[in-house]
């Protein structure tokens, strides 16, 4: 039993501690190949390749705020979400927005979470309460996750809402006991 | 699947310390806070502190100020508490519990008898 | 330190009947309240937090109100499973503290 999904105020989901990600299952081997579905032509393509780390995919950036239950983090933490499609690297920049013009058939990448870093957070709460802190476990970076499609289907199960979810944790206050560990805190020690 | 195993029971003279320990597993130690809660034999649950494996950084409870230290070794994910100049009321149940906040006790290891005895 | 004084310290109940535990804080806590369950020679675990926030995996007959000083756990209609001591905690100011528990037995 993980640490829970939960939305917060900002409608954030944020799982909590135990839930990491799991990333997507493999599908390389279960690969089959349909021959009406590539028009007649051999399966390969020129621009296929069998090397995963020939590929590449979008880290995009955003920055939000953590809650949790009436509390909200003094600073915004910043986090990646990995996006959609993969392409080779040498192609990516043209490849966004065009979908799969550059292999029409074979092998799909999807791009998923690749690993996290846990952040503290400190957080602010109403009414004087005593400051509270939580961990917060976010993407640090994406990979592109070779999967295959089945025998004539040709949309994949979308990876994305359950392996690009952020992990949630929280941060200890600042005390003024603890001049090394507010000072770490200040520095960001993440 | 996160698990929390602690030490064995210990039997202590008053006066001794006591250093009970905590295996985590499922998550690293680093990404959580350790709190460590006692029970005294038929009694409620006392909260005695937490601490942060990353940077070191502890709160007791007041009253055991002074006597605990609550520690961490990353490398093999296990939180220590330490319990020092003991005395028969310290006669408890040692649980350490994790969780990704300050306040809040999401995972509990099985629990330690101490016994403090002349 | 805030004091949890919880009522009753036991109660009696049958297999289906509704159960309700407060808890009373000794000045506000707004709504800074977990709720655990623990069963003889057991560790304790977490039900709720937040006051009405159902943690992982506990069945939604568990449900947990109030905010200030005044707070309730209530379960909708009592299992086998669910006869236990309940505890409740402050978590709004330092030290956190625990309620003295309710012992909930089979009638």
């Known amino acids: 039993q993980g640490w829970q999904a939960f939305k917060n105020d900002a409608t954030e989901i944020i799982p909590e501690l135990g839930e990491y990600p799991e990333p997507p299952p493999e599908l390389e081997n279960n690969k089959t190949m349909n021959r009406a579905e590539n028009g007649g032509r051999p399966p390969h393509h020129p621009f296929e390749t069998k090397d995963v780390s020939e590929y590449s995919c979008r880290e995009l950036h955003f920055t939000r705020y953590v809650t949790d239950g009436p509390c909200r983090s003094a600073k915004p933490v910043t986090e990646l979400v990995c996006s959609g499609q993969c392409g080779p690297a040498r192609l990516l920049p043209n490849a966004i927005g065009r979908g799969k013009w550059w292999r029409p058939s074979g092998p799909d990448f999807r791009c998923i979470p690749d690993r996290y870093r846990a952040q503290r957070v400190q957080l602010l709460c109403p009414g004087g309460e005593a400051p509270r802190a939580r961990k917060v476990r976010l993407v640090a970076s994406c990979k592109c996750k070779r999967l295959t499609r089945f025998h004539n289907q040709s949309e994949l199960k979308d990876f994305g809402t359950e392996a690009a979810r952020p992990q949630k944790g929280r941060k200890p206050r600042p005390r003024a006991r603890s001049a090394k560990a507010n000072q770490a805190e200040l520095e960001n020690a993440y | 699947q996160v698990q929390l195993v602690q030490s064995g029971a210990e039997v202590k003279k008053p006066g001794a310390s006591v250093k009970v320990s905590c295996k985590v597993s499922g998550f690293p130690i680093k990404d959580t806070f350790q709190h460590w809660v006692r029970q005294a034999p038929g009694k409620g649950l006392e909260w005695m502190g937490w601490s942060d494996p990353e940077i070191g950084d502890t709160e007791y409870a007041s009253k055991f100020q002074g006597r605990v230290t609550m520690t961490e070794d990353t490398s093999t994910d296990t939180a220590y508490m330490e319990l020092s100049s003991l005395r028969s009321e310290d006669t408890a149940v040692y649980y350490c519990?994790?969780?990704?906040?300050?306040?809040?006790?999401?995972?509990w290891g099985q629990g330690t008898t101490v016994t403090v005895s002349s | 330190d805030i004091q949890m004084t919880q009522s009753p310290s036991s109660l009696s109940a049958s297999v289906g009947d509704r159960v309700t535990i407060t808890c009373k804080a000794s000045?506000?806590?707004?709504?800074?309240v977990a709720w655990y369950q623990q069963k003889p020679g057991k560790a304790p675990k977490l039900l709720i937090y937040w006051a009405s926030t159902r943690w992982t995996g506990v069945p939604s007959r568990f449900s947990g109100s109030g905010s200030g000083t005044d707070f309730t756990l209530t379960i909708s209609s009592l299992q086998p499973e669910d006869f236990a001591t309940y505890y409740c905690q402050q978590y709004s100011d330092y030290p956190w503290t625990f309620g003295g528990g309710t012992k909930v037995e089979i009638k």
């Open positions: 519990a994790t969780g990704d906040t300050t306040y809040k006790f999401d995972f």
């Open positions: 000045q506000d806590v707004h709504t800074a």
